[in-house]
């Protein structure tokens, strides 16, 4: 057993049938002696009676809150929370594995450029009784500061019959060195409580690896006199890195025909601007990516040809 | 050329090759799946590689006030990596395919390391540790790891000279 | 075509030594291993050892306690096996075999004993 | 080291049916959670043995009605219609950890 937080306490189950459980002694937070009896949630029968209450912890029904009272008077409470290990495995109830970019990823995170910023976000079915606490650090062993907001509910998706909830926690690490090559990753950490089971989601990376900048702004194209050709030209995002001499976007231009199925032509530039061939409902897509460091692209940027 | 005592070195030469060094980087080990380290042990396969660090003057800022301490530090990378991808983690089994980027990526090390120090000059240079891994498969998780860090040094060696190539060069 | 021809039957007294050799021809000596494995009458394989002779790497079993010696000689692309201190319990047919151990630069790795020796057979009997 | 135990010792099987062998390591002969370090060696009497399965790639040359299975501790190596020329003993072979260790041999007949 661990406290979570004041009055919160886990405790952690070997989950199994038949599983003995844990034996827990609870302590009224309170100078009396005597006359004191203990309660579990809203239920009105007494438990036990004296300033420490042990009990044997097998299943969700012993978890809840704990309050001792003297003569109808409220004198302390403790919270007991369930974390379930199943074959030597914490459970992973509350999170939706997003399977990307490998099984069991319940965290993704992603930086828009060098300065520290990153946002994580996860999914859970779950709607109500639900909350998230989320720390992170630079290191584990020595760790290095990094502030996290409050996690929120960014978006509600249906799929198929159930709803899907995605949260999102921004966090920004105190002392960030941009130019600096990261030797530490960042960890993040998420506590996750539903009801009365309690979980708990963690990420490693460095910042370089989660980079992914925003499209590129500004897309515009200038026919060329007497030809189908045209010049792309664009922009880097606002929320780039800078100077852009030093943090440069290699960027893709690509044309898109109104079907799918049709051609793609590719081509790569460290310029911000290309000359491409403009087909007839075709589309000019630009994407940008760190030009020193495979990172994820960026989303597209388009404009059609006419 | 980074003549130690301070003048300036081929930014433009020193921009492409290391550009060149990214694209080797990447080709010698792309990011296919993702490996699972975790079941790995890591004892024995530890590597402590130079990094740029916060105070090493990397930074723009840096680079316009003084230059010499970020193209040191970078010298002195090179010379690690190069020695590393000439040691036996890389030529010992299981031996790399012939047509592995490993190779280029060694002379390209070189190359660079020598556009940064002439013959006669000499920065100081970081003690390679010696890692003989006794089990190969170790090799594959050393040369994993180390050419992961090669790509972020490299990224930052070539954001470095880029920028000196933009703004220092006479 | 690859070959690999080893040296004719032995029979040794205990505790003396035995050297068996497996030349090599049809390929680069050099791009590829020579795995030793030996296989005790009516019983399984035992992988003894591996010598790499591009990187001169060797590889043993400690289980023979020093007591065997890998060797290749490049110039006549022929591999040695010694074993020393030999006892009853040694008696066994020893193969060589072509190694190939091959990665891209970190996974997957491809690992082959392709192609065998006959086989020598050493006999350990006072 | 690593121990490889094979199973069954010795296996008798009809003329077209299938054969299956089993291999548990006594630790994880997988790389990074998937690239496979464990082999399959077939041996006719009086012969070397013969590299048939690598990994998890079936050599060229032999018949596809071998496959390769598992990772981790547990493989199998399948024979999905037993024909009179598979009779041989079958040996796996890990090559994660030096010393390289190999099971002790399936015996594999026609009943």
């Known amino acids: 057993i661990w406290e979570l937080k004041k009055d919160v306490y886990v405790v952690e189950l070997d989950w199994y049938p038949d599983a003995p459980g844990e034996m827990v002694v609870l302590t009224c937070d309170t100078p009396e002696e005597d006359g004191i009896t203990w309660t579990l949630d809203q239920s009105s029968e007494v438990l036990g009676s004296g300033k420490t209450l042990t009990i044997q912890v097998k299943e969700f029904g012993d978890a809840g809150q704990y309050t001792c009272h003297k003569g109808g008077e409220v004198l302390s409470h403790s919270l007991l929370l369930l974390h379930k290990k199943e074959d030597g495995i914490w459970s992973t109830d509350i999170l939706k594995d997003q399977k990307e970019p490998k099984n069991k990823t319940f965290l993704r995170c992603e930086a828009k450029n060098y300065s520290g910023r990153f946002t994580c976000w996860w999914l859970t079915t779950i709607s109500t009784d639900l909350t998230f606490s989320v720390k992170s650090s630079r290191g584990s062993s020595d760790p290095q500061g990094v502030t996290c907001g409050a996690a929120t509910l960014s978006a509600e998706r249906v799929r198929g019959d159930n709803k899907e909830y995605e949260y999102s926690v921004e966090c920004q690490e105190d002392s960030a060195c941009p130019a600096a090559e990261e030797s530490l990753p960042i960890e993040v950490m998420v506590d996750a409580v539903h009801k009365l089971k309690y979980e708990n989601y963690t990420s490693s990376f460095f910042i370089r690896d989660i980079i992914k900048p925003d499209p590129p702004k500004n897309l515009q194209l200038k026919p060329l006199k007497n030809s189908r050709q045209v010049e792309v030209s664009w922009e880097y995002p606002d929320t780039w890195s800078t100077p852009h001499s030093y943090f440069s976007l290699t960027f893709c231009v690509q044309v898109q025909g109104k079907s799918k199925r049709e051609k793609k032509d590719r081509v790569f530039t460290d310029k911000t601007s290309a000359t491409v061939i403009c087909r007839k409902n075709a589309s000019i897509s630009v994407r940008a990516q760190d030009r020193y460091y495979s990172s994820s692209w960026s989303e597209w940027a388009s404009v059609p040809c006419s | 050329r980074a003549v130690p005592g301070g003048s300036s070195p081929a930014w433009t030469q020193c921009q492409q090759l290391s550009q060149k060094l990214c694209t080797l980087a990447w080709s010698a080990h792309p990011l296919v799946g993702h490996m699972d380290l975790r079941e790995e042990g890591d004892e024995e396969t530890t590597n402590d590689v130079p990094h740029i660090q916060c105070g090493d003057g990397c930074d723009p800022q840096g680079l316009r006030d003084n230059s010499q301490f970020c193209l040191q530090r970078i010298h002195q990378g090179l010379i690690f990596y190069e020695k590393l991808l000439g040691s036996d983690i890389f030529t010992g089994e299981p031996s790399l395919l012939p047509d592995s980027p490993v190779g280029q990526l060694h002379a390209s090390l070189l190359g660079l390391s020598q556009l940064l120090q002439p013959e006669g000059h000499h920065w100081e240079t970081q003690q390679i540790p010696s890692l003989s891994p006794s089990q190969p498969w170790q090799r594959l998780l050393l040369r994993f790891k180390i050419l992961r860090s090669l790509q972020a040094f490299v990224a930052v060696a070539a954001r470095v000279f880029a920028h000196g190539a933009a703004t220092l060069s006479p | 075509q690859v070959q690999l021809v080893q040296s004719g039957a032995e029979v040794k007294k205990p505790g003396s030594s035995v050297k068996v050799s497996c030349k090599a021809s049809?390929?680069?000596?050099?791009?590829?291993?020579i795995t030793w494995v030996r296989q005790a009458p009516g019983q399984g394989l035992e992988w003894m050892g591996e010598?790499?002779?591009?990187?001169?790497?060797?590889y043993y079993n400690e289980k023979f306690k020093g007591r065997v010696t890998i060797t290749a000689d490049k110039s006549t692309s022929t591999a040695y096996m010694e074993l020393s201190s030999l006892r009853s319990e040694d008696t066994a047919v020893y193969y060589c075999?072509?190694?190939?151990?091959?990665?891209?630069?970190?996974?997957?790795?491809?690992?082959?004993?392709?192609?065998w020796g006959q086989g020598t057979l050493v006999t350990v009997s006072s | 080291d690593i121990v490889m135990t094979q199973s069954p010792d010795s296996l008798a099987v009809s003329l077209g049916e299938r054969a299956t062998i089993n291999c548990k390591a006594s630790?994880?002969?997988?790389?990074?959670?998937?690239?496979?370090?464990l082999h399959w060696y077939q041996q006719k009497p009086g012969q070397p043995p013969k590299l048939i399965y690598n990994?998890?790639k079936l050599e060229s040359g032999v018949p596809d009605r071998f496959s390769g299975s598992g990772s981790g501790t547990d493989f199998t190596l399948t024979i999905s219609s037993l024909q009179a020329e598979d009779v041989a003993v079958y040996y796996c072979?890990?090559?994660?950890?030096?010393?390289?260790?190999f099971g002790g041999g399936t015996k594999v007949e026609i009943k």
């Open positions: 010598d790499y002779p591009r990187s001169g790497n060797t």
């Open positions: 075999a072509r190694s190939e151990f091959i990665s891209t630069v970190v996974a997957p790795y491809y690992y082959a004993l392709d192609y």
């Open positions: 990994g998890a």
């Open positions: 072979l890990q090559n994660k950890e030096v010393p390289y260790t």
């Open positions: 630790k994880k002969v997988t790389i990074f959670g998937s690239t496979s370090a």
């Open positions: 049809g390929y680069t000596f050099t791009s590829y291993g």
